[in-house]
């Protein structure tokens, strides 16, 4: 059994998340994840889910009762989602930490917009073989 | 030329984002995007970047001077990033709109954590061929 399971159960107790009423009104994440089979689509959704959990954990980082559980789970996310790749995790964290109300950040974001947009679709990537693979993947996932 | 280019130039004027000093202290997004060649890694990063732009646009949605530009750019993101798939965009929006401080949302998130974690790594998906492809891809992108 993965170590995160025991720690997630500990979090459940802390948040009273094992109560039957928690399942009322559908799921937050699970139904959405079931909708997307193609890996690139799943990453789009999981990226948002992981950033949600990181924000949640940040809000409770000073609570000693769950600190070990939170650290264990974060470590497991780093292994599973970021392939133990610190640079990937650091780049992700940078993106999640930008303040959308900071005028300097706003100006930079708008300055970079055209180039960001040009790279958004898989077909925009260079390399004919890669591009044709992408295109097949996109069609299959739609 | 894609229609978003003209509208992005309009946003640049509005935010004074064409000034030379905007490039000071590095980029927000472009250097990070250059780091990641593998499509699934790019989607992880682009997911955060797109949600940043959507939040930014939301903050300025009532400003008539840039409303048309914002709508055109959002439409182009929907085409390029979400493949014109409304369900994909709707699921993404749901995820970005969850409030991390809402106790009911917190409880649901913790309740779902074990299942979310179990699906985080590509290897968790069924299919030996798919899994081995993923692993090759993952190594190449680290």
């Amino acid at each position: 059994q993965d170590p995160y399971v025991k720690e997630a159960e500990n979090l459940k107790k802390y948040f009273n998340a094992g109560d039957p009423d928690v399942a009322d009104n559908g799921t937050l994440f699970l139904d959405i994840l079931r909708n997307w089979k193609e890996e690139s689509d799943r990453k789009i959704m999981q990226s948002q889910i992981v950033s949600f959990y990181f924000k949640l954990f940040k809000n409770f980082k000073d609570d000693q009762r769950i600190q070990k559980s939170v650290e264990t789970i974060k470590e497991d996310i780093n292994v599973k989602f970021f392939n133990s790749n610190k640079k990937k995790r650091d780049d992700f964290e940078k993106l999640t930490n930008y303040s959308v109300t900071d005028s300097n950040v706003q100006r930079k974001a708008v300055h970079e917009l055209i180039q960001v947009m040009a790279e958004l679709s898989p077909a925009a990537k260079i390399g004919k073989r890669k591009r044709s693979q992408m295109f097949r993947g996109r069609r299959a996932s739609q | 030329q894609d229609p978003y280019v003209k509208e992005a130039e309009n946003l640049k004027k509005y935010f004074n984002a064409g000034d030379p000093d905007v490039a000071d202290n590095g980029t927000l997004f472009l250097d990070i995007l250059r780091n990641w060649k593998e499509e699934s890694d790019r989607k992880i990063m682009q997911s955060q970047i797109v949600s940043f732009y959507f939040k930014l646009f939301k903050n300025f949605k009532d400003d008539q001077r840039i409303q048309k530009s914002v709508e055109t750019i959002k439409e182009d993101i929907n085409v390029k990033f979400f493949n014109s798939n409304k369900k994909k965009r709707d699921d993404f929006e749901k995820l970005t709109n969850y409030s991390v401080t809402d106790s009911n949302v917190q409880r649901k998130a913790v309740h779902e954590l074990i299942q979310v974690m179990a699906e985080l790594s590509p290897a968790a998906k069924i299919g030996k061929r798919k899994r081995s492809q993923m692993f090759r891809g993952r190594r190449a992108s680290q």
Epitope: W36, R139, Q142 | N83, K87
Partner: antibody, heavy 123, light 111 residues
Framework: EVQLLESGGGLVQPGGSLRLSCAAS????????MSWVRQAPGKGLEWVSA????????YYADSVKGRFTISRDNSKNTLYLQMNSLRAEDTAVYYC????????????????WGQGTLVTVSS | NFMLTQPHSVSESPGKTVTISCTRS????????VQWYQQRPGSSPTTVIY?????PSGVPDRFSGSIDSSSNSASLTISGLKTEDEADYYC??????????FGGGTKLTVL
């Protein structure tokens, strides 16, 4: 109340042309993607063509590509379908339909539908 | 392109429940919204379910829509059948490549 009223159908010989119109009222026409859907006699529904709210993007079924042209005049709240090189298999009731979801630039579903106009291609 | 396959016809008695299936031939049924239209004889189609499971105002809650990823199909369920429900029913989805697909239609007979 949203209303869509098609016109322009009729009998035409193979190889001939027709122009269908759809007059829209009861909603902000330019905010919605619009479509044409057809139904051959006794058969099912077949999507034919779609156009974004601005008119900047158009989409066609493979069966009509290169022969049919969709357009719209937002100042007149009217949708058009120019049909050229008509074939016997184009015989159908043609429905004009509004996108059910506001502000999405390609239609995802169709609501409401007009009453339809019959196009008969026969010699 | 995928196809949406529906049974040609179904029949059931008034007051009973009937389910009409719509199976997607390739790609995931869950990855695009599914709609259901009712077409009574001599009339234009009207929406009874949109975006998988949403009911337009005016459509009774006897109509419900669902998605089943394991069978890669969508379903329209009508409970408490009435004679006025007798009609053709079509499922529809967007294929992601700027094409809109309809199922072949199912004729519902209320016995």
């Amino acid at each position: 109340e949203v209303q869509l009223l098609e016109s322009g159908g009729g009998l035409v010989q193979p190889g001939g042309s027709l122009r269908l119109s759809c007059a829209a009222s009861g909603f902000t026409f330019s905010s919605y993607a619009m479509s044409w859907v057809r139904q051959a006699p006794g058969k099912g529904l077949e999507w034919v063509s779609a156009i974004s709210g601005s008119g900047g993007s158009t989409y066609y079924a493979d069966s009509v590509k290169g022969r049919f042209t969709i357009s719209r005049d937002n100042s007149k709240n009217t949708l058009y379908l120019q049909m050229n090189s008509l074939r016997a298999e184009d015989t159908a009731v043609y429905y004009c339909a509004k996108d059910g979801s506001s502000g999405w630039y390609v239609p995802h579903w169709f609501d409401p539908w007009g009453q339809g106009t019959l196009v008969t291609v026969s010699s | 392109n995928f196809m949406l396959t529906q049974p040609h016809s179904v029949s059931e008695s008034p007051g009973k429940t009937v389910t009409i299936s719509c199976t997607r031939s390739s790609g995931s049924i869950a990855s695009n919204y599914v709609q259901w239209y009712q077409q009574r004889p001599g009339s234009s189609p009207t929406t009874v379910i949109y975006e998988d499971n949403q009911r337009p105002s005016g459509v009774p809650d006897r109509f419900s829509g669902s998605i089943d990823s394991s069978s890669n199909s969508a379903s329209l369920t009508i409970s408490g059948l009435k004679t006025e429900d007798e009609a053709d029913y079509y499922c529809q989805s967007y294929d992601g490549s700027n094409r809109w697909m309809f199922g072949g239609g199912t004729k519902l007979t209320v016995l």
